[in-house]
């Protein structure tokens, strides 16, 4: 057990200088997965801080993170992703402050990509899709998205609408006439995994139609 | 050494209402969820819900729901486990456990009996 | 809720021979290698002991003549070989999907 003072009023007492936050990512390169971790604070002076992970790891007691830049990073098999592990700050052999964490509750998964958006004009809808790594992998394979679009000139209204399957319908009568859209999409565990949102996809641009006078409908791309 | 310690045993009436304590100790509160989990006489085991005391975030086994309130101290590290409207079929040794991960218990309380009856 | 039905119901085993108890979930328990099953041993009048989690992890302290093996539906936990403190009750238990739901037990007595 981590070595810190058991009163309530205590346990908070680490250096708060050097609280940190982390995330998993499983099978992120075959079967590897990686943990990164940072400091919150970005001025903490890191130039002797070493990151250590003990605990609930396969046939090894703790492993040390490489630093690369602010960031520190592991890329192993050996996360027993069951128990929680002690991740600590060290200067030499001294912890400075240490995290219980459970790698499954830290999971930020990849993100998506490919975003498209295709106009059917029969329809009057637009068909939304996109590809996630995840669907080729063997634990984080369940993923709720969020989908986020806005009118170009909107700088901050965005429509978001949350799914758990890669397409999406966005209906033309929703949209108005003629316009720029953005849209972009992110993912986050559901079901056992627990975490955080990905990173956005990159994104996608298109222009709504047209209003086709004669009809009341928009005219196609 | 890491211990969970309970509060001594309740007689009640039904339709009353309990309060059990569980005071943990050798370890940072905080760095585990605590569960309860009751057992009655000659009965299996059922899990009732869990707390996180860091958040106070609570998950409550959904046969409970209404009826279970689990709460934190971080001051002096316990959690208590209130159950109300008290049947005679909620007579069980009520034991308090630390997961040591998603979601086993390494961890018990000693128990605590709760005798429901008129 | 997922089921856990344990078997067999009781068994009696003679000292230095082998006890296997099975446990069999309604639905499947893993993701991949995450075996989401452990065990437990409940002597009278005591609380729960861990003794395996994650379906093969043996808990700190515990004697390794207890192991665990299985995936998705399929459990086995395995005392080999049983000594007469073995006596107890032993209770699988799912955490996959809330309620974490323990199975009905399994009464070993030693001959």
């Known amino acids: 057990e981590s070595g810190y003072a058991q009163n309530g009023d205590l346990e908070d007492a680490e250096l708060d200088d050097y609280s940190f936050s982390c995330y998993s990512q499983l099978e992120v390169n075959g079967s590897q997965h990686s943990l990164t971790c940072a400091f919150e604070d970005p001025d903490v002076n890191i130039t002797n801080l070493e990151f250590e992970i003990c605990g609930a790891l396969v046939e090894v007691k703790c492993l040390n993170f490489r630093k690369l830049q602010e960031i520190y990073f592991i890329e192993t098999k050996k996360f027993l992703l069951i128990g929680k592990s002690n991740i600590c700050v060290k200067v030499g052999e001294k912890s400075l402050t240490c995290k219980k964490i459970d790698l499954t509750t830290i999971v930020k998964p990849e993100a998506p990509f490919d975003l498209s958006v295709v106009y059917r004009e029969g329809a009057n809808d637009f068909v939304v899709t996109f590809n996630t790594s995840h669907l080729q992998k063997k634990y984080v394979k369940v993923l709720m998205h969020d989908v986020a679009y806005r009118q170009e000139k909107d700088e901050n209204k965005w429509t978001h609408v949350n799914l758990s399957s890669t397409k999406l319908t966005l209906l033309q009568r929703k949209l108005q006439p003629a316009a720029m859209y953005e849209i972009k999409v992110r993912s986050i565990p559901d079901h056992y995994f627990k975490g955080f949102w990905s990173e956005w996809s990159p994104s996608y641009y298109f222009r709504t139609p047209e209003i086709n006078n004669s009809s009341g409908e928009m005219d196609p791309i | 050494q890491v211990q969970l310690v309970q509060s001594g045993a309740e007689v009640k009436k039904p339709g009353a209402s309990v309060k059990v304590s569980c005071k943990a100790s050798g370890y940072r509160f905080t760095d585990y969820e605590l569960h309860w989990v009751r057992q009655a006489p000659g009965q299996g085991l059922e899990w009732m819900g869990g707390?996180?005391?860091?958040?106070?975030?609570?998950a409550y086994n959904q046969k409970f729901k209404g009826r279970v309130t689990m709460t934190s101290d971080r001051s002096t590290s316990t959690v208590y486990m209130e159950l109300s409207s008290l049947r005679s079929e909620d007579t069980a040794v009520y034991y308090c456990a630390r997961s040591g991960g998603r979601w086993y218990f390494d961890v018990w309380g000693q128990g605590t009996t709760v005798t429901v009856s008129s | 809720d997922i089921v856990l039905t344990q078997s067999p119901a009781s068994l009696a085993v003679s000292p230095g021979q082998r006890a296997t108890i099975t446990c069999r979930t309604s639905e499947s328990v893993s993701i991949h290698l995450l075996h989401l099953m452990h065990w437990y041993q409940q002597k009278p009048g005591q609380p729960p002991k861990l003794l395996i989690y994650?379906?093969?992890n043996l808990e700190s302290g515990v004697p390794a003549r207890f192991s665990g093996s299985g995936s998705e539906t399929d459990f086995t936990l395995t005392i080999n070989p049983v000594e007469a403190e073995d006596t107890a009750n032993y209770y699988c238990q799912q955490s996959i999907k809330d309620p974490y739901t323990f199975g009905g037990g399994t009464k070993v007595e030693i001959k």
């Open positions: 707390i996180d005391p860091k958040t106070g975030g609570t």
């Open positions: 994650g379906a093969s």
